[in-house]
């Protein structure tokens, strides 16, 4: 699997989409997991509804939500209030029994908010920022890792 990069703005929502063959994965629940190191396990963050027919219902774990369009074949994960610690490698998975097929490998990148003064010593108030609403990037930007790009930092 190639790794697809999704970029989101700190403090905003990031939507990650994972397309799949709806016939091949018919009846299967899906999951979103975080890759722990290059060879480490993929730690489950959130999974779709226990009843496959209700997969369209949004399920949430903290700031991460998941919903599955089983007919269209698109799994959608939403990361709300994106933070720097959310950056990293993830997988969309299709579950069958105790096994999991990888639908897509994802790298989440968190960009600094252009309006984020970051300085706790600043005097930012939201009421003075409302006029800049259009500057907030609500959608995600995605691309595939180019050949030769290193998905994980080399281990020493």
């Amino acid at each position: 699997h190639n790794t697809t990069v999704f970029q989101g703005v700190e403090g905003q929502s990031l939507q990650v989409s994972c397309p799949y063959d709806s016939m091949k994965h018919w009846g299967r629940r899906k999951a979103w997991c975080r890759q722990l190191g290059e060879k480490g396990p993929c730690q489950r963050v959130v999974s779709t509804h226990n009843l496959w027919l209700l997969s369209f219902l949004r399920r949430r774990n903290g700031s991460t939500a998941i919903t599955d369009d089983t007919l269209g074949g698109t799994l959608t994960i939403t990361l709300r209030n994106l933070q720097p610690h959310d950056a990293g490698f993830y997988q969309c998975q299709s579950l069958h029994g105790s096994e999991a097929d990888t639908l897509r490998k994802v790298l989440v990148e968190v960009l600094a908010d252009p309006l984020d003064h970051r300085d706790a010593g600043d005097l930012w108030v939201p009421g003075e920022s409302e006029s800049f609403e259009d500057a907030h990037v609500e959608h995600s930007i995605s691309r595939s890792l180019l050949e030769g790009e290193i998905p994980f930092p080399p281990t020493s």
Partner: antibody
Framework: EVQLLESGGGLVQPGGSLRLSCAAS????????MTWVRQAPGKGLEWVSA????????YYADSVKGRFTISRDNSKNTLYLQMNSLRAEDTAVYYC???????????????WGQGTLVTVSS | DIVMTQSPDSLAVSLGERATINCKSS????????????LAWYQQKPGQPPKLLIY???TRESGVPDRFSGSGSGTDFTLTISSLQAEDVAVYYC?????????FGGGTKVEIK
Amino acid sequence: EVQLLESGGGLVQPGGSLRLSCAASGFTFSTHAMTWVRQAPGKGLEWVSAISANAGKTYYADSVKGRFTISRDNSKNTLYLQMNSLRAEDTAVYYCASLRGGYEVGPTFDSWGQGTLVTVSS
Amino acid sequence: DIVMTQSPDSLAVSLGERATINCKSSQSVLYSSNNKNYLAWYQQKPGQPPKLLIYWASTRESGVPDRFSGSGSGTDFTLTISSLQAEDVAVYYCQQHYIWPITFGGGTKVEIK
């Protein structure tokens, strides 16, 4: 432990001046915005003024604008409030507080001093 | 300026009973970018400076007992003490942290009945 200690209060005649100080310890003063809030005897809280960590930005309540000046000396970990043209209605306990700010949070006041009483009377 | 109006002015509640304080802002303090309400609550006990209890309308400050909870959105907010304790006797203030100038409500005095 965060400590804020106000000083400089006292009795002053209408039209007079006073300078309040707030000595800070227990946190990195130079990275925190600071504020003054006052409370007239038996009354509620009134925000007075605020200053950013680098002193590049200041705000004032309309009731004190043009008369009060907020400043800070990060090398001395001290916040100041210069009060000129004082009026009877400025009589209050003046609190200095550290301001939890930055993007997303907005200004809330998370640590307070014990306050210093300013009485404006002839 | 945003005007903050609290009600009631005072409240007498029996120990262990629920206390509810209301706060209304003259304009919305909801920031559409992150869907957070910029409304804080403070507690001031007699002879002491105020203490931050809640910000973003419902986020408890670290160390604040969970009997204190905040709710509401837009212009109407509530502070609830689910089971009043003797140490909760104080004046409670709401504060908008949405725009300068920062403004406080007039305060609500909570006493034991």
